[in-house]
């Protein structure tokens, strides 16, 4: 007689990343009996919700339910029906909602209210929608990449099973770039973390980690662009803004009301003699870089050393995984290869930004113009942030690994968030048979 396969004893979890520019739903799967083992959870699905981030629904909250439907229905299809009721669903909102909360707690609450009502209608085990802190976003991103890279596993191997593995237990730092914030998280070398707000202590799988993290609100790529425009329009002589961060021949009309809508531009706000202005691209990398540097205040530092804006940053240590928009932008620009030096990246950016807009549109006909037009700025911003903001050098550039996925799972905060909330990261090294949980992060 034929052997019948036993039904696989697996569990699922769903995390929605409600970012500033869009929402993504991730489905994770793991063997039920290996919950405490490191590296067993993997992503089986990513569904990108069509439309903007949830904070943009503030004037149309009644549309949030429809907005989430497609991806939630996809989850219903992917996860076996018998598992629905025990599958946790978490929604974490990041910097877009932090900014909305700064503007109006009531409006932010209204968005969360409708999100909760919508997600509670599905057959899963809804576990709440919350605005996570920047510190959590950094920490969970760090946990995700190190979990996926096998850095928490105590078994030393003579062979490499994952890319970037250096066969040691030294963790990778995490560099995360979103639309509204950016996070830097790593274990400094024997360095006191001088500001308590930036210090995290973890005990994971029997080992202690003293981790530095900071989230720079308003320094995600989209909000950084709004900041730069608000800064530059202050000194424009008329309603034409000749902008080196856009391709020659590019033109776009911007409403002043849109420019000043975000709390990120408040410091540059002034009464302008016009309601609109026109961006005219001139495509000059060096000038764009200089303009971006003006967003980083490096004149004040109350610590032994700082990143910018008076924020403590210890000396960089070890290898770093750069993900989310760091990866997407550099991938588009074809600059993710380990072999590409920082000098080469800069050269490529100079050439790219100088290309006429009409030529760019022809070369990348399949790409939406809104996104296409901003790659010159975004690429230049990434270089400025990493080099001048975080103090990477031409030499240490080779320690940055632009990562999209590791072992099929997206690099980002969502996996670390779920691992923590499902109590799957034990403080102590589990015995071969998982017995009980200890302290969780």
């Amino acid at each position: 007689t034929q052997n019948k396969a036993l039904p696989e004893n697996v569990k699922y979890g769903i995390v929605l990343d409600a970012g500033s520019s869009h929402t993504s739903l991730y489905i994770y799967k793991w063997p039920a009996e290996k919950e405490n083992d490191t590296g067993v959870v993997h992503q089986v699905e990513e569904c990108r919700v069509k439309g903007p981030g949830i904070s943009k629904f503030v004037q149309k909250v009644n549309e949030i339910g429809i907005y989430l439907t497609d991806c939630m229905e996809r989850a219903r299809e992917v996860i076996p029906r018998s598992q629905h009721q025990e599958t946790p669903v978490y929604l974490g909102a990041t910097a877009g909602m932090r900014l909305l909360r700064m503007e109006s707690e009531e409006l932010a609450d209204r968005v969360l209210d409708v999100v909760e009502r919508s997600l509670s209608n599905y057959p899963f085990d809804f576990q709440g929608a919350r605005i996570i802190t920047g510190q959590e976003e950094g920490a969970y991103g760090w946990i995700t990449i190190n979990y996926l890279l096998g850095k928490f596993s105590q078994k030393t191997r003579w062979f490499s099973i994952v890319p970037y593995e250096t066969n040691n237990q030294e963790t990778f730092g995490a560099l995360d770039l979103g639309g509204a914030s950016t996070q830097v998280t790593f274990v400094p070398q024997n360095q006191t973390i001088e500001s308590p707000d930036n210090a995290l202590q973890f005990r994971l799988y029997g080992k202690d980690y003293n981790v530095y993290t900071h989230s720079f609100l308003c320094y995600g790529k989209d909000q950084a662009l709004w900041q730069k425009l608000a800064k530059d329009i202050q000194v424009a002589s008329n309603e034409i803004l000749r902008d080196p961060c856009f391709h020659p021949g590019y033109k776009k009309v911007v409403n002043v009301s849109d420019l000043y809508k975000t709390p990120c531009t408040k410091r540059f706000e002034m009464t302008l003699p016009f309601q609109q202005f026109e961006i005219q691209g001139i495509g000059n990398y060096q000038q764009c870089h200089q303009s971006i540097l003006e967003l980083f205040n490096t004149s004040y530092c109350p610590y032994s050393q700082c990143a910018f804006n008076g924020i403590f940053l210890p000396p960089l240590q070890g290898d770093f995984g750069a993900f989310s928009a760091f990866y997407f932008v550099m991938k588009f620009l074809n600059l993710t290869s380990e072999k590409v030096s920082q000098e080469k990246v800069t050269e490529m950016m100079k050439k790219f930004c100088a290309q006429p807009w009409e030529e760019i549109k022809t070369s990348y006909a399949g790409v939406k113009e809104k996104y296409l037009s901003e790659y010159c700025f975004s690429g230049t911003y990434i270089l400025s942030l990493l080099l001048q903001g975080y103090h990477f050098t031409a030499d240490s550039w080779e320690h940055i690994h632009f990562i999209g996925k590791i072992q099929g799972s997206d690099a980002g905060w969502t996996l670390g968030y779920m691992l923590n909330l499902t109590n799957m990261i034990p403080a102590e090294q589990p015995l071969s048979t998982p017995l009980s949980h200890s302290t969780y992060v």
Epitope: E105, E106, D109, L112, D113, E116, I131
Partner: nanobody
Framework: EVQLVESGGGLVQPGGSLRLSCAAS????????MSWYRQAPGKAREWVGS????????TYQNSVKGRFTISRDNSKNTLYLQMNSLRAEDTAVYYC????????RGQGTLVTVSS
């Protein structure tokens, strides 16, 4: 300054009931949704449920549905959590939060379910 003070915790036998209260001040209570969270020893903090600003809508995680009820009295700036049919696994420190907050502000109140 926003303040949230939880009370009403204690030792209760399995199957018993408790009612937790949360006194709010420093913000317009009736304008914001509220949530209850709990944290058991050695576990991550867990969402229990939420209530809308007006009190017209509540939602809960599956393990407490049908046993726990969240309510609010906007005239008294107070949030409640009625817990029935308590189980050993409900043992935790319970926190109330404003739904928009990223973390609890209060000290919480300890609920121990044991025979």
């Amino acid at each position: 300054e926003v303040q949230l003070v939880e009370s009403g915790g204690g030792l209760v036998q399995p199957g018993g009931s408790l009612r937790l209260s949360c006194a709010a001040s420093g913000f317009t209570f009736s304008n914001l949704g509220m949530s209850w969270y709990r944290q058991a020893p050695g576990k991550a903090r867990e969402w229990v449920g939420s209530i809308s600003a007006s009190g017209d809508y509540t939602t809960y995680q599956n393990s407490v549905k049908g046993r726990f009820t969240i309510s609010r009295d906007n005239s008294k700036n107070t949030l409640y959590l009625q817990m029935n049919s308590l189980r050993a696994e409900d043992t935790a420190v319970y926190y109330c939060t404003r739904r928009v907050d990223s973390y609890p502000r209060g000290q919480g109140t300890l609920v121990t379910v044991s025979s």
